[in-house]
Interface confidence: medium
């Protein structure tokens, strides 16, 4: 036997070590009820406590709850370790248009690159499918394998990341190309309304149903708890949070203990009828031509929008703007005020309500 | 020899609050997860919550959570469950019980507190 | 949070005869390769005893007579031939998911 070899059975007599065979060293013996981070421990750092299923040990010592991807829209990026929340993402065919903790609040289909365009990135989980204009010359049917690689889904064109354009541009703006780095600074500038839920949080045992901790009696930090599917309003009262089981609508924030429940029309759907936190009555959205070219827009929302040929070419296409006008909304559901006869005319995410004028223009609906 | 000694019964008037004790012994006190269950007369059992001593770590049973306070002080390896707004529906037996790492089980219980509520 | 249903409510056996109770989860208890099913004996005046754990491991000092089988949702706590002492409730608990849950309880008493 070498020399520097432990005994086996006693690690040299240290009580508080044993000889693992596997890794032929002697391991820390966690103490009773610590578990060991790694097969061979070697000081008491490497042992931990242990948490509840589906909980793991955050930086601060903390059981905290694994996100979960339990929504359709969602898959299983990473499982929950013992140290680290399950991380979830966009199912294949989707992309990420709100982004939350370890997960997406909010997944688009990947847009369909209209005739006239080809696939210049496909969509990942992160990013939407990026189109460009087919080359002069080049066929439609696709120049390369790689600009075919289009969702098979037959979705509505949907987003494009782009720059956000200040409300003080003009509709002769040139359009930015390659943006996207100043759009996604455009888009960490946009403040959200004081009172709107941010779906950027610290994953709880138990959201919306009760308080974050304990509430001894006069605590400032108690609030009255709410039954599930019920938030906790400004006036203080358990008020039901809007259910989003319509066909035509999708959960876009969950209920929350402060806050509602919020619901938008469903993808390739606008809003006709606005109502709180949702949406009386979606209709489908308006399918531009085929001579339309992506356009950059908004980062914000990553909602798709195109260029429209001179205005009045297509009076049944929504156009769509040579800037984003659009301020960060304050309210669930996006709400802007469109001029059906005006020159310019502004973005209409699929979030926004919008209600057919007698024209059988839509005019966006301020709800 | 694991011990989990808690005080004794109680009597307590509606609205008031009760706060049973569970005494550990024989074990790294600070390393296991302490369980509250409760035992309403005849019934059957449920989980409150748990507290980690060794940080003061909690979970909690929604149902019970913002009227349930679980503490633990380490110094005397005693372990602590408060129970605020009491109605007569509290009227039960409470335990304490230490949870196993790796399984999850309970495995050493103390005796029991039975805690009355009556006007 | 996951229901436990425990069926028999009540089981009226012999001394020597074989019982075997059930209790079903309304979801998989599976969680990495085991199922997080437990089960306890309680006396009257006495607290809850570990049986079983991992739906199947017998705790130190139970008799070999307990056996627990069963993954996913469908679990079986079996006393193969039941002692005087055996006669007590039977309770499964879950710890898959916070809040941990226990079945209604299932009483084994003399027929």
């Known amino acids: 036997f070498p020399q520097d070899r432990p005994f086996e059975d006693t690690c040299h007599g240290n009580p508080s070590h044993y000889y693992d065979k596997a890794v032929r060293r002697c391991c820390y013996r966690c103490p009773m009820g610590l578990f060991p981070t790694q097969q061979c421990p070697q000081r008491p750092t490497d042992c931990r406590k242990q948490c509840e299923p589906d909980y793991y040990l955050d930086e601060a010592d903390r059981c905290t709850a694994c996100v979960t991807c339990s929504r359709d829209d969602l898959v299983e990026k990473t499982p929950c370790a013992w140290n680290s929340s399950r991380v979830c993402e966009c199912r294949p065919g989707m992309f990420c248009s709100t982004s939350a903790v370890n997960s997406c609040a909010r997944c688009f289909f990947h847009s369909v690159c209209p005739a006239g365009m080809i696939v210049k990135f496909p969509g990942t989980a992160q990013k939407n499918t990026v189109c460009e204009p087919a080359s002069p010359g080049v066929s439609p049917a696709c120049a390369s394998p790689e600009n075919c690689k289009e969702p098979s889904s037959g979705t509505i064109p949907q987003a494009k990341p782009t720059p956000v354009s200040p409300a003080t541009s003009s509709a002769s703006t040139m359009p930015v190309r390659g943006g996207t780095r100043l759009a996604q600074e455009a888009a960490s500038k946009l403040t959200r309304a004081p009172d709107s839920p941010s779906s950027v949080g610290r994953p709880s045992s138990d959201p919306g149903l009760s308080p974050t901790q304990p509430c001894p009696e006069g605590s400032g930090d108690c609030r009255k708890q709410c039954e599930p599917d019920y938030y906790l309003d400004e006036a203080g009262r358990c008020t039901a949070c809007v259910s989003c089981s319509r066909d035509d609508l999708v959960e876009k924030t969950p209920c929350a203990w402060n806050s509602s429940r919020t619901c938008e029309c469903r993808p390739g759907m606008i809003c006709a009828t606005s109502a709180t936190n949702s949406c009386a009555r979606c209709v489908p959205y308006p399918i531009c031509a085929a001579e339309t070219v992506t356009k950059p827009q908004d980062m914000a929302e990553k909602d798709t929008t195109f260029e429209a040929p001179p205005l009045g070419t297509q009076p049944d296409c929504n156009p769509t703007p040579e800037n984003g006008e659009a301020p960060a909304s304050t309210s669930p559901t996006q709400s802007l005020l469109v001029d059906s006869q005006a020159s310019k005319t502004l973005p209409i995410p699929t979030s926004a309500p919008v209600a057919l004028s007698s024209t059988g223009k839509p005019v966006l609906d301020a709800g | 020899e694991v011990q989990l000694v808690q005080s004794g019964a109680e009597v307590k008037k509606p609205g008031s609050s009760v706060k049973v004790s569970c005494k550990a012994s024989?074990?790294?006190?600070?390393?296991?997860?302490m369980n509250w269950v409760k035992q309403a007369p005849g019934q059957g059992l449920e989980w409150i919550g748990q507290?980690?001593?060794?940080?003061?770590?909690?979970n909690y049973n929604g149902k019970f959570k913002g009227r349930v306070t679980l503490t633990a002080d380490k110094s005397s390896s005693t372990a602590y469950m408060e129970l605020s707004s009491l109605r007569s529906e509290d009227t039960a037996v409470y335990f304490c019980?230490?949870?196993?790492?790796?399984?999850?089980?309970?495995?050493?219980w103390g005796q029991g507190t039975l805690v009355t509520v009556s006007s | 949070e996951i229901v436990l249903t425990q069926s028999p409510a009540t089981l009226s056996l012999s001394p020597g005869e074989r019982a075997t109770l059930s209790c079903r989860a309304s979801e998989s208890l599976e969680y990495y390769g085991t199922s997080l099913m437990l089960w306890y004996q309680q006396k009257p005046g006495q607290p809850p005893k570990l049986l079983i754990y991992?739906?199947?491991n017998v705790e130190t000092g139970i008799p070999a007579r307990f056996s627990g089988s069963g993954s996913g949702t469908d679990f079986t706590l079996t006393i193969s031939s039941l002692e005087p002492e055996d006669f007590a409730v039977y309770f499964c608990?879950?710890?898959?998911?916070?809040?941990?849950?226990f079945g209604g309880g299932t009483k084994v008493e003399i027929k």
């Open positions: 019980a230490r949870r196993i790492n790796g399984n999850f089980a309970m495995d050493y």
């Open positions: 507290i980690y001593p060794g940080d003061g770590d909690t």
């Open positions: 991992s739906a199947s």
């Open positions: 024989g074990y790294a006190f600070s390393s296991y997860w």
């Open positions: 608990q879950q710890r898959r998911k916070v809040p941990s849950t």
